[in-house]
Interface confidence: low
């Protein structure tokens, strides 16, 4: 557990003192303060909030708090030329127009600077044409349309429902299918939970509510104009034609009232099966085009948004370590919001604020952590994880040599049912041990541990008596630290019951209705779930920064590597004939995993036995643990995704939010039966097995005795 010897402090200053200092009432107060006006990236309001946070972190007692600014590509609607979608008749007259803004929630009618719903980084354009309904616009949805139904999306405007996968993947898929525009909408099947009222009377999405969001396919690049390098004062910027990840067709989001008007007229093919039907009273016909009476009518998009290089500001706070100041544990979450940010991000930012305050209180009483803790309030996360990525690009040499761990702190809640954790396997035991020490906030679990309620409500699919912990994907600020730099990372928040609520995310995500009142009235009136998340995030940071031996268990990596190798092998074995024809063998990978398992086991034994009073040996063992995650990084990156360099995990090529294991092999095998050159395709599978096997073996050797 946490040690007090090394940092020369009284026993009072332990994890318990830190946790006891965290107060739900403070989190509530901070959330209110952070959500009264919009804090859109690149705006004056968000700069002022950055300065406020800087000032308060200094007051709380951090050693230094600096602003780090970058000039990055952002995107905004034109104030005087709004975006909308029309139905036009044969004469070109607009007979229906979608709404230009969301009806503001009660109490916010006079707030200025509420950015209207838009798809950030959409190009300008006014395409018109027939509509095709493409379900969620996933890879498999386009396979169904093109291969089974023989429907061609080329030259069509597609309409897709939000949910299941990251919206940028939907747009990429539509582009590849030849579409000339994309309309995204929120279907009540995904964003309206049965038996709950619409905001302001409940937490459901009203018909006029719309989800904003970026539609980039950055693949970890950060600022689209400066991939790989910080967008600083002397940056060389690419031309817009060479920018990374920008969509090439206009895109616009709408709510379900407007979607109803577009979908009710749809003709053409019937939906292929019930999984293509949402909850609107429309036929969910696929199209193309409108039915009989309306067949001469078309859909027209009017998109006038613009991209501009704009200044953003991260806030970086430092609490210097007493013993190992050159080892960094980072707690970071974003500050920018689409509108008020009641959940995303300020429910997370308020928790970070309270964690900083608690650490500051201990520091004022003479305590210091063993290792340095860095706190970050990131900007422009909503525009593609830009603030965190630019800062990491600027500080990559320090981070790759000194970075122990990164804990993410975006939204603290997406429900109030149970805990949700995604992290590196190195942190599994840390999370298990910590949650066993924390009280559950859940009704019916009074006096029980968080571990117990979490395990009961969200059991591991593999190990009985243990909770589910998921793989890290992307879509948040840990991406650059984990997927590019190989720094052990984790995230925790309270979530919904996925069994009973099958809608995607939470209904009011990225809408104007994501307010303080949404949280205070409907999600967490006592702020007890926020407090629990603060204890989990803060407790992880405390233990990572203060325990004498880093709380990483390399044996857990061995377990998952075997699981992932089994999984990818079984995918490949769906093609036994080709594996035989092209001599595809996984022996090297299984052998490497076996070696890793044995070496990890021996390392763990040495970790129990070594002399912890010898600072050189202690530092050596800790460095082996710190650098293990780094050992899974391939400097060449994944094919066509140079900034995704982790060989064991990457964001799925089909859904940025999801994590994929052995992604290089997985992508090489994906849809391999449709490849025009099977010999080349299976050659790439073999190459990826080689890369994976080598990387696992090389990582194992970092845990071997050094000499």
């Amino acid at each position: 557990k946490s040690s007090n010897e090394a940092t020369n402090i009284t026993p009072k200053h332990n994890m318990k003192a830190f946790l006891d200092e965290l107060k739900a009432e403070n989190i509530k107060k901070f959330l209110y303060n952070f959500t009264q006006i919009p804090h859109l990236a690149g705006t004056e309001q968000n700069f002022q909030l950055a300065k406020q946070i800087q000032s308060q972190w200094k007051e709380f007692g951090l050693d230094s708090v600096e602003l780090a600014h970058y000039d990055v590509l952002l995107s905004y609607p034109n104030k005087t030329h709004p975006n909308y979608i029309s139905i036009i008749n044969e004469d070109g007259n607009e007979i229906f127009n979608t709404s230009l803004f969301e009806p503001p929630p009660p109490g916010y009618e006079n707030v200025s600077d509420i950015v209207p719903p838009f798809s950030a980084f959409s190009p300008q354009g006014m395409p018109e044409g027939d509509l095709v309904y493409v379900n969620y616009a996933r890879t498999e949805d386009f396979f169904k349309l093109e291969r089974d139904m023989k429907i061609n999306c080329s030259g069509k405007i597609v309409i897709a429902r939000y949910g299941k996968v990251f919206r940028g993947n939907k747009v990429k898929n539509a582009q590849l299918a030849g579409a000339k525009g994309v309309i995204l909408y929120s279907d009540p099947a995904d964003y309206f939970a049965p038996g709950v009222k619409s905001y302001p009377d409940g937490w459901n999405l009203p018909g006029g509510g719309v989800q904003r969001g970026n539609i980039l396919n950055l693949n970890g690049a950060g600022d689209p104009l400066t991939p790989g390098y910080p967008a600083n004062e002397y940056a060389y910027r690419r031309g817009i034609a060479e920018a990374v990840g920008l969509p090439s067709i206009p895109v616009h989001p709408i709510g379900y009232y407007d979607a109803q008007k577009l979908l009710e007229k749809m003709g053409g093919s019937a939906p292929p099966d019930s999984s293509w039907r949402g909850s609107l009273k429309v036929p969910y016909n696929v199209g193309p085009g409108f039915t009989g009476n309306f067949s001469t009518q078309k859909v027209k998009m009017h998109i006038h948004s613009t991209n501009e290089v704009t200044r953003i500001y991260n806030v970086i706070g430092t609490l210097r370590g007493a013993v190992e100041p050159d080892r960094y544990v980072i707690l970071g979450g974003h500050r920018d919001s689409w509108v008020f940010g009641g959940i995303d991000p300020q429910s997370g930012a308020a928790v970070v604020h309270e964690i900083v305050r608690s650490f500051g209180t201990l520091k004022k009483e003479g305590w210091r952590p063993r290792r340095t803790i860095l706190f970050a309030s990131w900007d422009a996360e909503e525009f593609g994880l830009l603030g965190s990525t630019e800062w990491a690009e600027e500080n990559s040499r320090l981070l790759q040599e000194r970075g122990v761990a990164y804990i993410n702190a975006d939204s603290s809640i997406e429900g109030n049912y149970t805990l949700r954790v995604d992290c590196t396997p190195l942190m599994y035991s840390l999370v298990h041990n910590l949650t066993k020490e924390l009280k559950s906030p859940d009704e019916g679990f009074e006096g029980k541990s968080l571990y117990e309620s979490w395990t009961k409500k969200s059991p591991s699919p593999e190990f009985s008596g243990m909770p589910r912990i998921s793989k890290l994907g992307s879509g948040n600020d840990f991406e650059v630290f984990f997927q590019r730099l190989g720094i052990a990372s984790g995230r925790a928040r309270y979530t919904k019951n996925w069994e009973t609520n099958k809608f995607s995310g939470y209904p009011l995500y990225h809408s104007v209705y994501e307010t303080y009142e949404l949280v205070e009235k409907f999600y967490d009136p006592m702020f007890k779930y926020h407090l629990t998340v603060a204890q989990v995030r803060g407790g992880m940071v405390f233990e990572l920064a203060n325990s004498i031996v880093l709380p990483f268990d390399c044996r857990d990596y061995a377990v998952v590597l075997r699981k992932y190798a089994d999984k990818i092998y079984s995918i490949s074995m769906k093609h036994p004939q080709e594996m035989k024809t092209y001599s595809v063998s996984f022996d090297s990978l299984f052998s490497a995993v076996k070696n890793f398992t044995e070496i990890a086991s021996k390392f763990s034994e040495r970790l129990q036995d070594f002399d912890k009073s010898n600072p050189i040996v202690l530092r050596m063992m800790n460095d082996q643990l710190m650098f293990l995650e780094r050992a899974f990084i391939d400097p060449l990156g994944l094919p066509d995704r140079p900034f995704y360099r982790h060989v064991i995990y990457a964001p799925s090529s089909h859904n940025k939010y999801a994590g994929e294991s052995f992604p290089g092999i997985y992508d090489a095998l994906f849809d391999i039966e449709s490849k025009v050159d099977p010999s080349k395709a299976w050659g790439e599978v073999k190459r990826q097995i080689y890369v994976a096997a080598f990387t696992v073996q090389a990582a194992a050797e970092t845990l071997s005795e050094v000499a």
Epitope: L40, E44, Q45, F47, Y76, P77, N78, N307, R311
Partner: nanobody
Framework: QVQLVESGGGVVQPGRSLRLSCAAS????????MGWYRQAPGKEREFVAA????????KVSDSVKGRFTISRDNSKNTLYLQMNSLRAEDTAVYYC???????????????????WGQGTQVTVSS
């Protein structure tokens, strides 16, 4: 309400400099962005330059880039436009504008719902 009063205009020879000022009064705490527009005789009003409250976001039109500099002194609630290397085509009435709205590329696109001064005449002539 916000009141804007421009000063510093006048007649000047080509190649010389002028500095325009715009003093803001009233509810200035709500102002996030200020800028300069100009209108030459018989032409439409044209954007010149804009600056956000902190000065972190600035925009200058291509026609005056490298010659005109925008700045502001928040302690005095004053906006400035330093105009160097003046040309005959810079002759116009120069208007100060202020807005409590700010997002995006169009943060410097002031419209009639924003605050405007009465204008100050700048004439560049030999």
């Amino acid at each position: 309400q916000v009141q804007l009063v421009e000063s510093g205009g006048g007649v000047v020879q080509p190649g010389r400099s002028l500095r325009l000022s715009c003093a803001a009064s009233g509810r200035t705490f709500g102002i996030y962005v200020m800028g300069w527009y100009r209108q030459a005789p018989g032409k439409e009003r044209e954007f010149v330059a804009a600056i956000s409250w902190s000065g972190s976001n600035r925009k200058v039109s291509d026609s005056v880039k490298g010659r005109f500099t925008i700045s502001r002194d928040n302690s005095k609630n004053t906006l400035y436009l330093q105009m160097n290397s003046l040309r005959a085509e810079d002759t116009a009435v120069y208007y100060c504008a202020a807005s409590n709205k700010l997002y995006g590329r169009t943060w410097y696109d002031f419209n009639e719902s924003d605050y405007w001064g009465q204008g100050t005449q700048v004439t560049v002539s030999s």
